[in-house]
């Protein structure tokens, strides 16, 4: 089949040359390449008023390759598509369109969001967090001894940051009140230096059990001061031990 086609081509182009350049299997002085070597694509290039056949290792941007037994040729992608594997499978859309499952869309379908960096429709990614790490030792002013009341903190990591339309991350830091080990501090003992140092007092409007650690405070909005008398504190002493309040950075 290929041989007979080759013979037909030679009859049509009596000046077929066997000393072809650049990947051509057969060519003519006037028409350039007539057929290509294996794994090369045949394309027509316009030079002035005439079209010249060329053989390319890959199709130019905006075109895709199609294989046939006797020729591999380049065909134009759809109008809204920059690069494609075929007319039904775009890999990069023209400006102003979003790529989704090989198609170029004006707007992303329901349940997906537009990524304006990659110009793709992507799944909405919700925040994922790890399990809580264990509570830190109970401390007060950085010491783990000598005081009855202190605070302990625990943290968890963000495993998956949310996309623009995804659910925000829940708190990643949690602090609660606790009872410090009932042991007398040794002379000169400073205790463990924790992040819990230099605390601000609990603030008004905030449950008094919540004492955000300094890491959270850096990126949280400042909370107005809350004052409570000793009587109120005494009243809620039992509840304090169990309760915990979460403070977190918004991600």
């Amino acid at each position: 089949q290929n041989a007979s086609r080759g013979r037909r081509q030679r009859r049509m182009h009596p000046n077929v040359s066997q000393g072809c350049q650049g990947g051509c299997a057969t060519c003519s002085d006037y028409n350039g390449c007539l057929s290509c070597k294996p794994r090369l694509f045949f394309a027509l290039e316009r030079i002035g008023m005439k079209q010249i056949g060329v053989c390319l290792s890959s199709c130019p941007s905006g075109y895709y390759g199609t294989r046939y037994p006797d020729i591999n040729k380049c065909t134009k992608c759809k109008a809204d598509c920059d690069t494609c594997f075929n007319k039904n499978f775009c890999t990069k859309c023209k400006s102003g369109f979003y790529l989704h499952l090989g198609k170029c869309l004006d707007n992303c379908p329901e349940g997906l969001e537009a990524n304006n960096h990659t110009m793709e429709c992507v799944s909405i990614v919700h925040c994922e967090v790890s399990e809580w790490n264990p509570w830190s030792p109970c401390t007060k002013k950085g010491k783990t001894c000598g005081f009855k009341r202190g605070t302990e903190t625990r943290v968890r990591e963000i495993i998956q940051h949310p996309s623009a339309k995804g659910n925000l991350c829940p708190p990643t830091n949690e602090t609660r009140k606790c009872t410090v080990q009932r042991k007398k501090c040794q002379k000169g003992e400073r205790g463990k230096k924790g992040r819990e140092r230099k605390r601000k007092k609990p603030n008004k409007g905030e449950s008094k059990e919540a004492i955000p650690d300094s890491k959270s405070l850096e990126s949280s909005k400042e909370i107005p001061e809350q004052r409570e008398n000793k009587q109120q504190q005494k009243k809620r002493k039992v509840q304090d031990k169990q309760k915990s309040v979460s403070v977190s950075t918004v991600h």
Epitope: S58, T66, R67, Y68, T83, N86, K87
Partner: antibody, heavy 117, light 111 residues
Framework: QVQLKQSGPELVKPGASVKISCKAS????????FHWVKQNHGKSLDWIGY????????GYNQKFKNRATLTVDTSYSTAYLEVRRLTFEDSAVYYC??????????WGQGTTLTVSS | DIVLTQSPASLAVSLGQRATISCKAS??????????MNWYQQKPGQPPKLLIY???NLESGIPARFSGSGSGTDFTLNIHPVEEEDAATYYC?????????FGAGTKLELK
């Protein structure tokens, strides 16, 4: 003669990451797109995604999008597949393949990944 | 996704006989007059090997006893006459839409 040579077998713990390589020779590396395919224990084949070596543009099967990353190093004519947060279900043979006019015409020999604790 | 259903899952054929494998797509894999369906052969411990591209075109170097036919949603791979070296698993694969998908495979054994 087109050849795709993949890196050796991998034994990895769950939760870890792995990076498999595929070195191409015998043709101009940037001419064809690279695709990666997963095969579970001699069962069917699952397409992971593709990458254009000429510009690094890549695309993924939604199934693998969040944990797989395809990259190329044109100076070494090598394509890479990285899979993160590995689970036991990721244990499989992974193939790289060149894509020529809508079919996979050359394949690597495959890289066996075993995820075990 | 386009689902490709291969049948039978396995078949046993005598040497010299015909083996026929079917692949049905959940939607058409044709576009602009071209069928984006390929067939591959895979032997144990080896990667798949392209046999037929665009539904009916024989890949270079593949024996003429392999042939492909069909369009739209129904495709067939024929092997005739079957030879000993043809014992393998055969997969159909569509390239028409994202994501690219494969059939579950048909295992050909010799009687």
């Amino acid at each position: 003669q087109v050849q795709l040579k993949q890196s050796g077998p991998e034994l990895v713990k769950p939760g870890a990451s792995v990076k498999i390589s595929c070195k191409a020779s015998g043709y101009t590396f940037t001419s064809y797109t690279f695709h990666w395919v997963k095969q579970n224990h001699g069962k069917s084949l699952d397409w992971i995604g593709y990458i254009y070596p000429s510009n690094g543009d890549s695309g993924y099967n939604q199934k693998f999008k969040n944990r797989a990353t395809l990259t190329v190093d044109t100076s070494y004519s090598t394509a890479y597949l990285e899979v993160r947060r590995l689970t036991f279900e990721d244990s499989a043979v992974y193939y790289c393949a060149t894509y020529f006019a809508n079919n996979f015409d050359y394949w690597g020999q495959g890289t066996t990944l075993t995820v075990s604790s | 996704d386009i689902v490709l259903t291969q049948s039978p899952a396995s078949l046993a054929v005598s040497l010299g006989q015909r083996a026929t494998i079917s692949c049905k797509a959940s939607q058409s894999v044709d576009y602009d007059g071209d069928s984006y369906m390929n067939w591959y052969q895979q032997k144990p411990g080896q990667p798949p090997k392209l046999l037929i591209y665009a539904a009916s075109n024989l890949e270079s170097g593949i024996p003429a006893r392999f042939s492909g036919s069909g369009s739209g949603t129904d495709f067939t791979l024929n092997i005739h006459p079957v030879e000993e070296e043809d014992a393998a698993t055969y997969y159909c694969q569509q390239s028409n839409e994202d994501p690219l998908t494969f059939g579950a495979g048909t295992k050909l054994e010799l009687k």
